[in-house]
Amino acid sequence: LDLSNVQSKCGSKDNIKHVPGGGSVQIVYK
């Protein structure tokens, strides 16, 4: 299971991966 693009809704922003666009996002970051 590839979780490399998962963006936490409530955790630290430090692990946000820079992806090339919205098509790569799995969860909308709040």
Epitope: G21, G22, K30
Partner: antibody
Framework: QVQLVQSGAEVKKPGSSVKVSCKAS????????ISWVRQAPGQGLEWMGE????????YYNEKFKGRVTITADKSTSTAYMELSSLRSEDTAVYYC?????????????WGQGTLVTVSS | DIVMTQSPLSLPVTPGEPASISCKSS????????????LAWYLQKPGQSPQLLIY???TRESGVPDRFTGSGSGTDFTLKISRVEAEDVGVYYC????????FGQGTKVEIK
């Protein structure tokens, strides 16, 4: 309130390089992407590339790859766009914009623009 | 590359009348996981920097008048102005951010 303030107008010779700066205030600089967009006289908007200051990671428009370099200095909340091997067709207004990364991926704040004129 | 095509390129309007701009993408802008279309609309007024009007195809940016409405999904999108006002003149651009960023050619809205 986020504000993006760009450096002043430049006149450059063909073959030279230009470096435009974009200083951000308000908000947390490293939490969003800075995109660079240009507009030639009387033409539309053209996306050049972007940087995620937190990591320094960049993406570029294939059209400009090899000629454009986007960097960021987190300590001064400033992004830079350097374009090399300038030609007359690069005469344009260059904008930086905050790209609301991770949510809308939309550019919600824009700099005032920097006119770069390439002329011999 | 994702290509964005706007129509019409020029739109003469009468104040108080509705106006509509179409934007088509060469591939779908819908992310099935987030259920969002990564399509935004911008207005560039004469002599100004562009300003964000709509994101996620239909979400109005804060402070944007409710006469502006974005709709559509996948590859076909529309920006509607319910009643055009004089201050709405300028060039409207759609932009995809599904993969990298691409702007449409722009639609110039001017008063008849």
């Amino acid at each position: 309130q986020v504000q993006l303030v760009q450096s002043g107008a430049e006149v450059k010779k063909p073959g030279s390089s230009v470096k435009v700066s974009c200083k951000a205030s308000g908000g947390i600089f490293s939490d969003y992407v800075i995109s660079w967009v240009r507009q030639a006289p009387g033409q539309g908007l053209e996306w050049m590339g972007e940087i995620f200051p937190r990591s320094g990671s960049t993406y570029y428009n294939e059209k400009f790859k090899g000629r454009v370099t986007i960097t960021a200095d987190k300590s001064t909340s400033t992004a830079y766009m350097e374009l090399s091997s300038l030609r007359s067709e690069d005469t344009a207004v260059y904008y930086c914009a905050r790209d609301y990364y991770g949510t809308s991926f939309a550019m919600d704040y824009w700099g005032q623009g920097t006119l770069v004129t390439v002329s011999s | 590359d994702i290509v964005m095509t706007q129509s019409p390129l020029s739109l003469p309007v009468t104040p108080g009348e509705p106006a509509s701009i179409s934007c088509k993408s060469s591939q779908s802008l819908l992310n099935s996981r987030t259920r969002k279309n990564y399509l935004a609309w911008y207005l560039q007024k004469p002599g100004q920097s562009p300003q964000l009007l709509i994101y996620w195809a239909s979400t109005r940016e804060s402070g944007v008048p409710d006469r502006f409405t974005g709709s559509g999904s996948g590859t076909d999108f529309t920006l509607k102005i319910s009643r055009v006002e004089a201050e709405d003149v300028g060039v409207y651009y759609c932009k995809q951010s599904f993969y990298l960023r691409t702007f449409g050619q722009g639609t110039k809205v001017e008063i008849k």
